[in-house]
């Protein structure tokens, strides 16, 4: 069989949600592979998944040490079999990524509604507060250690016998709404950067309602 | 021109600590993997890992995992391979080489550990 | 890891004739590198991602193969060409080598 032509990367797109982040391209490499290099604008370009196959990268582990940089990576398409590099004096194609920075731009991971407490007219609604990828000190930082008071949570919330939502903000993990006595409500919460111009909102939590399993109810 | 320089041969004893050196030049040092090559006596090659320069990550073959550690000190350019205790099976010939594509290969000269008592 | 076996151990050829190396890999490989190596020397890169010649290797020597089989072949062997070749797999890691094939002098 005739020889093919190495190929450039395209469609390099950033897919991050909660600083959990991976590069994807296409496209489906014939007779070559890649490899992926990522830089800060200032920095070394360091190479990561050597040779590969696959069409991702991830390059969260890059990305966490500093999720205020903004970085740029490139995938290098490399002959691999019955092919020929049609890149000039023997370097390798390469396509470059857009810009990416994570503190702006990482996605907000679907929130869950860790528990509610009802005592009398008042609830009390927590928002678990995820775990991210981000370490400082060899510990893990929650999305709240990392995000501080740019993140906030809008709560909705609304009686099981009807369909209006009332809303509430918090810029911690907690609620405290009121209720009326002897009525039953559902909840859902949704991460929010107001600062930001894009990705500003999560998805909706799953719907917790009163009277099932994650709520405690206490009369008083 | 782009040169890896080893430091010399090195004959120990088993038990003692060693470590030897693969100075590069020429090119941006912390831009480039430097893998780490093991060849025994009258033997083949083996590839022990490698270390990225500019924040010292390291990709180790578990095979050297806790007999082996490489490191690099920046400020001369510098990657190391060293032994806490040696053993008579550490005898070989280390190549350090650049990590490139293609044709770019660029290998140092070899530095000789002789372990014996 | 990915186990390399290279066949034969030892290829014992006259200058002019045709010498066919083997590499074999326990699983599937999608780069693998061959490597010359004479005495006293380093390894010297001689073919890189399965069939590209390296810069200066003429072109008597090809690379071919995919999957877990792997060919480098010299078509009329030159008197520099006696040395030892061993494939190298960086599909994943750790990063192997196979053993290695002594072309030597009959």
């Known amino acids: 069989s005739g020889t093919t032509n190495t190929v450039a990367a395209y469609n390099l797109t950033w897919k991050s949600t909660n600083f959990k982040t991976i590069l994807e391209w296409e496209p489906k490499p014939v007779n070559q592979v890649y490899t992926v290099q990522i830089s800060t604008k200032s920095g070394d370009w360091k190479s990561k998944c050597f040779y590969t196959t696959d069409t991702e990268c991830d390059l969260t582990d890059e990305i966490v040490k500093d999720v205020k940089q903004t970085y740029l990576a490139r995938v290098f398409s490399y002959p691999a079999g019955n092919v020929e590099s049609t890149g000039s004096a023997g370097e390798p194609l390469y396509e470059n990524s857009p810009e990416f920075t994570p503190y702006l731009e990482t996605n907000l991971g679907q929130p869950t509604i860790q528990s509610f407490e009802q005592v009398g007219t008042k609830v009390n609604v927590t928002v678990e507060d995820e775990r991210t990828l981000v370490r400082r000190n060899n510990t893990f930082l929650s999305l709240r250690d990392v995000f501080g008071k740019d993140l906030i949570y809008t709560l909705y919330y609304w009686k099981s016998s009807s369909s209006g939502k009332k809303t509430a903000k918090t810029n911690t993990n907690e609620f405290l709404i009121d209720v009326d006595k002897g009525e039953n409500y559902c909840f859902s919460v949704q991460a929010v950067i107001p600062s930001r111009t894009v990705n500003r909102k999560s998805t909706d939590s799953p719907v917790e309602c009163m009277g099932q399993e994650k709520g405690e109810f206490r009369e008083i | 021109e782009v040169q890896l320089v080893q430091s010399g041969a090195e004959v120990k004893k088993p038990g003692e600590s060693l470590k030897i050196s693969c100075k590069g030049s020429?090119?941006?040092?912390?831009?480039?993997?430097m893998n780490w090559v093991r060849q025994m006596p009258g033997k083949g090659l083996e590839w022990m890992g490698m270390?990225?320069?500019?924040?010292?990550?390291?990709r180790l073959n578990q095979k050297f995992k806790d007999k082996a550690t490489l490191s690099v000190d920046k400020s001369i350019s510098t990657a190391y391979l060293q032994w806490s205790s040696l053993k008579a099976s550490d005898t070989a010939m280390y190549y350090c080489?650049?990590?490139?594509?293609?044709?770019?290969?660029?290998w140092g000269q070899g530095t000789t550990v002789t372990v014996s008592s | 890891e990915i186990v390399l076996t290279q066949s034969p151990a030892t290829l014992s050829l006259s200058p002019g004739e045709r010498a066919t190396l083997s590499c074999s890999a326990s699983s599937s490989v999608s780069y693998m590198n061959w490597y010359q190596q004479k005495p006293g020397q380093a390894p010297r890169i001689w073919i890189y991602g399965i069939s590209n010649l390296a810069s200066g290797i003429p072109a008597r020597f090809s690379g071919s193969g995919s999957g877990t089989d792997f060919t480098l072949t010299i078509s009329s062997l030159e008197p520099e060409d006696f040395a030892v070749y061993y494939c190298q797999q960086k599909s994943s890691f750790p990063w192997t080598f196979g053993g290695g094939t002594k072309v030597e002098i009959k």
């Open positions: 080489a650049r990590e490139d594509y293609g044709s770019s290969d660029y």
């Open positions: 020429g090119y941006s040092f912390t831009s480039y993997w």
């Open positions: 270390i990225y320069p500019a924040d010292s990550e390291t």
